[in-house]
Protein backbone atom coordinates (compact mmCIF):
# COMPACT_ATOMS: atom_id res chain seq x y z
CA UNK A 1 0.00 0.00 0.00
CA UNK A 2 1.17 3.52 -0.80
CA UNK A 3 0.89 6.01 2.03
CA UNK A 4 -1.30 9.08 1.58
CA UNK A 5 -0.39 12.22 3.49
CA UNK A 6 -3.12 14.35 5.05
CA UNK A 7 -2.08 17.69 6.47
CA UNK A 8 -4.12 19.65 8.98
CA UNK A 9 -3.65 22.77 11.03
CA UNK A 10 -3.24 22.51 14.81
CA UNK A 11 -6.46 23.37 16.61
CA UNK A 12 -8.60 22.77 13.56
CA UNK A 13 -10.37 19.65 12.27
CA UNK A 14 -8.84 17.29 9.76
CA UNK A 15 -10.94 15.03 7.60
CA UNK A 16 -9.35 11.85 6.25
CA UNK A 17 -11.08 9.89 3.50
CA UNK A 18 -10.44 6.28 2.56
CA UNK A 19 -12.11 5.07 -0.65
CA UNK A 20 -12.78 1.36 -1.14
CA UNK A 21 -14.64 -1.10 -3.35
CA UNK A 22 -18.12 -1.13 -1.78
CA UNK A 23 -18.92 -4.61 -3.09
CA UNK A 24 -15.62 -6.18 -2.13
CA UNK A 25 -16.04 -4.96 1.45
CA UNK A 26 -19.82 -5.36 1.63
CA UNK A 27 -21.03 -6.20 5.12
CA UNK A 28 -17.69 -5.46 6.74
CA UNK A 29 -17.24 -3.02 9.58
CA UNK A 30 -14.36 -0.55 9.33
CA UNK A 31 -11.80 0.81 11.73
CA UNK A 32 -9.18 3.51 12.12
CA UNK A 33 -5.98 2.52 13.87
CA UNK A 34 -2.67 4.12 14.75
CA UNK A 35 0.54 2.41 13.72
CA UNK A 36 2.88 1.93 16.67
CA UNK A 37 6.34 2.09 15.18
CA UNK A 38 7.40 1.05 11.71
CA UNK A 39 6.72 -2.65 12.23
CA UNK A 40 4.58 -2.48 15.35
CA UNK A 41 0.89 -3.31 15.71
CA UNK A 42 -1.87 -0.98 14.61
CA UNK A 43 -3.74 0.14 17.70
CA UNK A 44 -7.47 0.57 17.18
CA UNK A 45 -8.64 4.13 17.73
CA UNK A 46 -12.26 3.89 16.66
CA UNK A 47 -14.47 1.54 14.65
CA UNK A 48 -17.79 1.89 12.88
CA UNK A 49 -21.10 0.90 14.42
CA UNK A 50 -21.41 -2.71 15.58
CA UNK A 51 -24.29 -3.10 13.15
CA UNK A 52 -22.99 -2.64 9.63
CA UNK A 53 -26.34 -1.26 8.46
CA UNK A 54 -25.81 1.64 10.89
CA UNK A 55 -22.26 2.38 9.73
CA UNK A 56 -23.38 5.79 8.49
CA UNK A 57 -23.84 6.90 12.10
CA UNK A 58 -20.85 8.86 13.31
CA UNK A 59 -19.02 7.21 16.19
CA UNK A 60 -16.61 9.09 18.40
CA UNK A 61 -13.68 8.08 20.54
CA UNK A 62 -12.38 11.20 22.22
CA UNK A 63 -11.67 13.72 19.47
CA UNK A 64 -11.75 11.15 16.64
CA UNK A 65 -14.90 10.29 14.70
CA UNK A 66 -15.60 7.67 12.05
CA UNK A 67 -18.44 7.28 9.57
CA UNK A 68 -18.86 4.95 6.60
CA UNK A 69 -20.69 5.52 3.33
CA UNK A 70 -21.14 1.83 2.56
CA UNK A 71 -22.89 2.43 -0.76
CA UNK A 72 -20.44 4.98 -2.10
CA UNK A 73 -17.47 3.17 -0.63
CA UNK A 74 -15.88 5.97 1.38
CA UNK A 75 -14.75 5.76 4.99
CA UNK A 76 -14.35 9.17 6.61
CA UNK A 77 -12.39 9.90 9.76
CA UNK A 78 -12.51 13.30 11.46
CA UNK A 79 -9.77 14.37 13.86
CA UNK A 80 -11.20 17.29 15.84
CA UNK A 81 -9.01 19.94 17.49
CA UNK A 82 -5.88 18.53 15.85
CA UNK A 83 -2.82 18.49 18.11
CA UNK A 84 0.89 17.90 17.37
CA UNK A 85 0.72 14.52 19.13
CA UNK A 86 -1.88 13.40 16.55
CA UNK A 87 0.80 13.35 13.87
CA UNK A 88 1.81 9.88 12.78
CA UNK A 89 1.00 6.88 10.65
CA UNK A 90 -2.52 5.44 10.65
CA UNK A 91 -4.54 2.86 8.72
CA UNK A 92 -8.11 2.61 7.50
CA UNK A 93 -9.15 -1.00 7.90
CA UNK A 94 -11.90 -3.34 6.75
CA UNK A 95 -12.76 -5.95 9.39
CA UNK A 96 -13.71 -9.56 8.81
CA UNK A 97 -13.72 -11.99 11.66
CA UNK A 98 -10.94 -10.84 13.95
CA UNK A 99 -8.75 -9.88 11.02
CA UNK A 100 -8.39 -6.61 9.17
CA UNK A 101 -7.54 -5.65 5.61
CA UNK A 102 -5.76 -2.35 5.07
CA UNK A 103 -7.79 0.01 2.91
CA UNK A 104 -5.33 2.89 3.04
CA UNK A 105 -2.19 3.87 4.93
CA UNK A 106 -2.36 7.47 6.08
CA UNK A 107 0.33 9.81 7.34
CA UNK A 108 -1.15 12.64 9.37
CA UNK A 109 0.95 15.80 9.48
CA UNK A 110 0.09 18.64 11.83
CA UNK A 111 0.97 22.15 10.69
CA UNK A 112 1.42 24.99 13.14
CA UNK A 113 -1.50 27.39 13.33
CA UNK A 114 -0.31 30.51 11.47
CA UNK A 115 -2.36 32.67 13.86
CA UNK A 116 -0.07 31.61 16.70
CA UNK A 117 2.89 33.43 15.14
CA UNK A 118 1.35 36.87 14.65
CA UNK A 119 1.58 39.93 16.88
CA UNK A 120 -1.53 40.45 18.95
CA UNK A 121 -2.06 43.74 17.14
CA UNK A 122 -2.44 41.92 13.87
CA UNK A 123 -5.05 39.53 15.21
CA UNK A 124 -8.75 39.98 14.67
CA UNK A 125 -10.96 39.01 17.55
CA UNK A 126 -14.65 38.34 17.15
CA UNK A 127 -16.97 40.85 18.75
CA UNK A 128 -19.55 39.86 21.32
CA UNK A 129 -22.12 39.09 18.66
CA UNK A 130 -19.63 37.22 16.51
CA UNK A 131 -18.38 33.77 17.27
CA UNK A 132 -16.44 30.88 15.72
CA UNK A 133 -18.77 28.48 17.48
CA UNK A 134 -20.93 27.90 14.41
CA UNK A 135 -18.05 27.72 11.98
CA UNK A 136 -17.06 24.24 10.88
CA UNK A 137 -13.52 24.58 9.66
CA UNK A 138 -11.97 21.54 8.07
CA UNK A 139 -8.62 21.78 6.40
CA UNK A 140 -7.32 18.77 4.55
CA UNK A 141 -4.45 18.58 2.11
CA UNK A 142 -3.51 15.14 0.92
CA UNK A 143 -0.77 13.70 -1.25
CA UNK A 144 0.88 10.34 -1.77
CA UNK A 145 4.32 9.75 -0.33
CA UNK A 146 7.00 9.99 -2.97
CA UNK A 147 9.04 6.89 -3.70
CA UNK A 148 11.80 6.64 -1.14
CA UNK A 149 10.08 8.82 1.45
CA UNK A 150 9.93 7.19 4.86
CA UNK A 151 6.94 7.85 7.13
CA UNK A 152 8.95 6.99 10.22
CA UNK A 153 12.43 8.25 11.14
CA UNK A 154 15.01 5.52 10.51
CA UNK A 155 15.84 3.43 13.56
CA UNK A 156 19.36 2.33 14.30
Amino acid sequence: HNTTVFQGVAGQSLQVSCPYDSMKHWGRRKAWCRQLGEKGPCQRVVSTHNLWLLSFLRRWNGSTAITDDTLGGTLTITLRNLQPHDAGLYQCQSLHGSEADTLRKVLVEVLADPLDHRDAGDLWFPGESESFEDAHVEHSISRSLLEGEIPFPPTS
Partner: antibody, heavy 123, light 107 residues
Protein backbone atom coordinates in the same frame (compact mmCIF):
# COMPACT_ATOMS: atom_id res chain seq x y z
CA UNK B 1 -30.75 -18.40 -8.54
CA UNK B 2 -27.02 -18.46 -7.85
CA UNK B 3 -25.18 -21.37 -9.43
CA UNK B 4 -21.53 -22.34 -9.52
CA UNK B 5 -20.80 -24.83 -12.27
CA UNK B 6 -17.45 -26.60 -12.20
CA UNK B 7 -15.54 -28.24 -15.02
CA UNK B 8 -15.61 -32.01 -15.43
CA UNK B 9 -13.55 -34.76 -13.85
CA UNK B 10 -9.88 -35.01 -14.84
CA UNK B 11 -7.45 -37.93 -14.96
CA UNK B 12 -3.82 -36.87 -15.13
CA UNK B 13 -0.33 -38.24 -14.77
CA UNK B 14 2.17 -37.00 -12.16
CA UNK B 15 4.10 -33.98 -13.43
CA UNK B 16 1.34 -32.79 -15.76
CA UNK B 17 -0.32 -29.40 -15.46
CA UNK B 18 -4.02 -28.78 -14.94
CA UNK B 19 -6.46 -25.89 -14.70
CA UNK B 20 -9.99 -26.47 -13.46
CA UNK B 21 -12.78 -23.89 -13.55
CA UNK B 22 -15.78 -22.62 -11.66
CA UNK B 23 -18.30 -20.56 -13.61
CA UNK B 24 -20.79 -18.38 -11.78
CA UNK B 25 -24.22 -17.46 -13.04
CA UNK B 26 -25.44 -13.90 -12.97
CA UNK B 27 -23.74 -10.53 -13.01
CA UNK B 28 -23.04 -10.59 -9.27
CA UNK B 29 -20.13 -13.04 -9.63
CA UNK B 30 -17.56 -10.25 -9.38
CA UNK B 31 -19.17 -8.97 -6.16
CA UNK B 32 -18.35 -12.00 -4.05
CA UNK B 33 -15.21 -13.77 -2.93
CA UNK B 34 -14.77 -17.28 -4.34
CA UNK B 35 -12.98 -19.95 -2.32
CA UNK B 36 -11.49 -23.30 -3.27
CA UNK B 37 -11.83 -26.26 -0.92
CA UNK B 38 -10.15 -29.65 -1.21
CA UNK B 39 -11.59 -32.95 -0.03
CA UNK B 40 -9.30 -35.94 -0.28
CA UNK B 41 -10.97 -39.37 -0.61
CA UNK B 42 -12.85 -40.19 2.60
CA UNK B 43 -11.44 -37.13 4.37
CA UNK B 44 -12.52 -33.74 5.61
CA UNK B 45 -12.60 -30.29 4.03
CA UNK B 46 -9.50 -28.13 3.56
CA UNK B 47 -9.64 -24.45 2.67
CA UNK B 48 -7.08 -23.74 -0.05
CA UNK B 49 -7.54 -20.05 -0.72
CA UNK B 50 -9.87 -17.35 -1.89
CA UNK B 51 -10.08 -14.74 -4.64
CA UNK B 52 -12.10 -11.60 -5.27
CA UNK B 53 -12.76 -11.73 -9.04
CA UNK B 54 -13.44 -8.01 -9.16
CA UNK B 55 -9.76 -7.14 -8.73
CA UNK B 56 -7.95 -10.49 -8.43
CA UNK B 57 -7.09 -10.05 -4.75
CA UNK B 58 -6.08 -13.54 -3.56
CA UNK B 59 -5.31 -15.17 -0.21
CA UNK B 60 -3.83 -18.65 0.16
CA UNK B 61 -3.67 -21.13 2.96
CA UNK B 62 0.02 -21.58 3.91
CA UNK B 63 -0.46 -25.30 3.19
CA UNK B 64 -1.28 -24.56 -0.46
CA UNK B 65 0.81 -21.43 -1.11
CA UNK B 66 3.19 -22.17 -3.97
CA UNK B 67 1.47 -25.47 -4.73
CA UNK B 68 -1.50 -24.06 -6.65
CA UNK B 69 -2.52 -20.83 -8.34
CA UNK B 70 -5.96 -19.29 -7.94
CA UNK B 71 -7.09 -16.84 -10.59
CA UNK B 72 -10.26 -15.44 -12.13
CA UNK B 73 -11.56 -13.90 -15.33
CA UNK B 74 -14.35 -11.54 -14.34
CA UNK B 75 -15.39 -10.96 -17.96
CA UNK B 76 -16.65 -14.54 -18.13
CA UNK B 77 -17.54 -14.91 -14.42
CA UNK B 78 -15.07 -17.75 -13.94
CA UNK B 79 -12.58 -18.65 -11.22
CA UNK B 80 -9.73 -21.09 -11.74
CA UNK B 81 -7.52 -23.42 -9.75
CA UNK B 82 -4.35 -24.62 -11.42
CA UNK B 83 -1.32 -26.82 -10.88
CA UNK B 84 1.91 -26.64 -12.83
CA UNK B 85 3.08 -30.10 -11.79
CA UNK B 86 0.59 -32.55 -10.33
CA UNK B 87 1.42 -35.17 -7.70
CA UNK B 88 -0.43 -38.34 -6.78
CA UNK B 89 -1.30 -36.67 -3.46
CA UNK B 90 -3.32 -34.04 -5.37
CA UNK B 91 -5.95 -36.70 -6.04
CA UNK B 92 -9.11 -35.25 -4.49
CA UNK B 93 -12.46 -33.61 -5.06
CA UNK B 94 -12.15 -29.85 -5.44
CA UNK B 95 -15.04 -27.54 -4.66
CA UNK B 96 -15.44 -23.84 -5.35
CA UNK B 97 -17.72 -21.93 -3.02
CA UNK B 98 -19.11 -18.42 -2.82
CA UNK B 99 -18.04 -16.60 0.30
CA UNK B 100 -20.78 -14.34 1.56
CA UNK B 101 -20.40 -11.71 4.26
CA UNK B 102 -23.39 -11.48 6.56
CA UNK B 103 -23.81 -7.83 7.49
CA UNK B 104 -24.64 -8.30 11.17
CA UNK B 105 -21.64 -10.55 11.67
CA UNK B 106 -18.93 -8.99 9.47
CA UNK B 107 -17.43 -12.34 8.60
CA UNK B 108 -17.92 -14.62 5.64
CA UNK B 109 -19.38 -18.08 5.14
CA UNK B 110 -19.74 -20.38 2.14
CA UNK B 111 -23.37 -20.19 1.14
CA UNK B 112 -23.25 -21.62 -2.41
CA UNK B 113 -21.03 -24.44 -3.63
CA UNK B 114 -20.11 -25.89 -6.99
CA UNK B 115 -20.81 -29.57 -7.62
CA UNK B 116 -17.11 -30.43 -7.32
CA UNK B 117 -14.41 -31.51 -9.74
CA UNK B 118 -12.78 -34.89 -9.16
CA UNK B 119 -9.08 -34.82 -10.00
CA UNK B 120 -7.29 -38.17 -10.21
CA UNK B 121 -3.52 -38.22 -10.54
CA UNK B 122 -2.07 -41.62 -11.30
CA UNK B 123 0.77 -43.02 -13.35
CA UNK C 1 -3.71 -22.04 12.18
CA UNK C 2 -6.79 -22.46 14.35
CA UNK C 3 -7.52 -26.15 14.95
CA UNK C 4 -11.15 -27.25 15.01
CA UNK C 5 -11.97 -30.47 16.84
CA UNK C 6 -15.35 -32.14 16.51
CA UNK C 7 -16.83 -34.81 18.72
CA UNK C 8 -17.95 -37.44 18.35
CA UNK C 9 -16.37 -38.62 15.08
CA UNK C 10 -19.47 -40.66 14.40
CA UNK C 11 -22.82 -41.15 16.06
CA UNK C 12 -25.63 -43.66 15.53
CA UNK C 13 -29.16 -42.45 16.13
CA UNK C 14 -32.75 -43.16 15.18
CA UNK C 15 -35.40 -41.04 13.47
CA UNK C 16 -36.95 -38.74 16.08
CA UNK C 17 -33.85 -38.67 18.29
CA UNK C 18 -32.22 -35.49 19.54
CA UNK C 19 -28.57 -35.30 18.53
CA UNK C 20 -25.86 -32.90 19.65
CA UNK C 21 -22.49 -32.47 17.93
CA UNK C 22 -19.77 -30.37 19.52
CA UNK C 23 -16.94 -28.37 18.02
CA UNK C 24 -14.01 -26.90 19.92
CA UNK C 25 -11.63 -24.24 18.60
CA UNK C 26 -7.98 -24.16 19.66
CA UNK C 27 -8.39 -20.44 20.43
CA UNK C 28 -11.28 -18.06 20.89
CA UNK C 29 -13.19 -17.31 17.69
CA UNK C 30 -16.02 -15.22 19.16
CA UNK C 31 -19.15 -16.34 17.27
CA UNK C 32 -17.48 -16.72 13.89
CA UNK C 33 -18.46 -20.32 13.29
CA UNK C 34 -20.47 -22.18 10.65
CA UNK C 35 -21.94 -25.66 10.39
CA UNK C 36 -22.26 -27.54 7.09
CA UNK C 37 -24.03 -30.75 6.12
CA UNK C 38 -22.56 -33.00 3.44
CA UNK C 39 -24.11 -36.04 1.86
CA UNK C 40 -22.05 -38.63 -0.08
CA UNK C 41 -21.02 -37.40 -3.53
CA UNK C 42 -22.48 -33.94 -2.90
CA UNK C 43 -21.16 -30.52 -2.03
CA UNK C 44 -21.48 -29.26 1.56
CA UNK C 45 -24.53 -27.19 2.44
CA UNK C 46 -24.48 -24.24 4.83
CA UNK C 47 -26.80 -24.84 7.79
CA UNK C 48 -25.74 -22.38 10.48
CA UNK C 49 -23.56 -19.28 10.37
CA UNK C 50 -22.45 -16.83 13.06
CA UNK C 51 -22.70 -19.77 15.51
CA UNK C 52 -26.49 -19.62 15.83
CA UNK C 53 -28.09 -18.07 12.72
CA UNK C 54 -29.97 -20.49 10.50
CA UNK C 55 -29.39 -20.17 6.77
CA UNK C 56 -32.48 -19.53 4.64
CA UNK C 57 -34.44 -22.71 3.97
CA UNK C 58 -32.84 -24.73 6.76
CA UNK C 59 -35.44 -26.49 8.95
CA UNK C 60 -35.94 -25.16 12.48
CA UNK C 61 -34.93 -28.51 13.98
CA UNK C 62 -31.33 -27.45 13.34
CA UNK C 63 -29.92 -25.04 15.89
CA UNK C 64 -26.47 -23.82 16.83
CA UNK C 65 -25.08 -22.29 19.99
CA UNK C 66 -21.85 -21.33 21.67
CA UNK C 67 -19.16 -18.68 21.51
CA UNK C 68 -15.47 -18.40 22.23
CA UNK C 69 -14.09 -21.92 21.90
CA UNK C 70 -17.05 -24.26 22.44
CA UNK C 71 -19.93 -24.71 20.03
CA UNK C 72 -22.77 -27.15 19.50
CA UNK C 73 -25.04 -28.16 16.65
CA UNK C 74 -28.32 -29.69 17.79
CA UNK C 75 -30.84 -31.57 15.68
CA UNK C 76 -33.97 -31.66 17.81
CA UNK C 77 -35.80 -34.50 16.06
CA UNK C 78 -33.86 -36.46 13.46
CA UNK C 79 -35.45 -36.95 10.06
CA UNK C 80 -34.36 -39.59 7.50
CA UNK C 81 -32.75 -36.91 5.31
CA UNK C 82 -30.53 -35.72 8.17
CA UNK C 83 -28.22 -38.73 8.03
CA UNK C 84 -25.04 -37.19 6.65
CA UNK C 85 -21.66 -35.84 7.72
CA UNK C 86 -21.49 -32.51 9.56
CA UNK C 87 -18.55 -30.11 9.60
CA UNK C 88 -17.88 -27.02 11.65
CA UNK C 89 -15.73 -24.19 10.23
CA UNK C 90 -14.18 -21.13 11.83
CA UNK C 91 -14.54 -17.77 10.06
CA UNK C 92 -12.35 -15.87 12.50
CA UNK C 93 -8.97 -15.99 10.76
CA UNK C 94 -7.23 -17.04 7.59
CA UNK C 95 -6.70 -19.78 6.75
CA UNK C 96 -10.27 -20.87 7.31
CA UNK C 97 -10.27 -24.30 8.95
CA UNK C 98 -12.83 -27.07 9.29
CA UNK C 99 -13.43 -29.71 11.87
CA UNK C 100 -12.69 -33.29 10.83
CA UNK C 101 -16.40 -34.08 10.51
CA UNK C 102 -19.04 -36.04 12.41
CA UNK C 103 -20.77 -38.85 10.57
CA UNK C 104 -24.40 -39.28 11.60
CA UNK C 105 -25.56 -42.84 10.88
CA UNK C 106 -28.84 -44.67 11.22
CA UNK C 107 -28.96 -46.93 14.25
Amino acid sequence: EVQLVQSGAEVKKPGESLKISCKGSGSSFTSYWIAWVRQMPGKGLEWMGIIYPGDGDTRYSPSFQGQVTISADKSISTAYLQWSSLKASDTAMYFCARSRTFYYDSSDYFDYWGQGTLVTVSS
Amino acid sequence: DIQMTQSPSSVSASVGDRVTITCRASQGISSWLAWYQQKPGKAPKLLIYAASSRQNGVPSRFSGSGSGTDFTLTISSLQPEDFATYFCQQADRFPRTFGQGTKLEIK
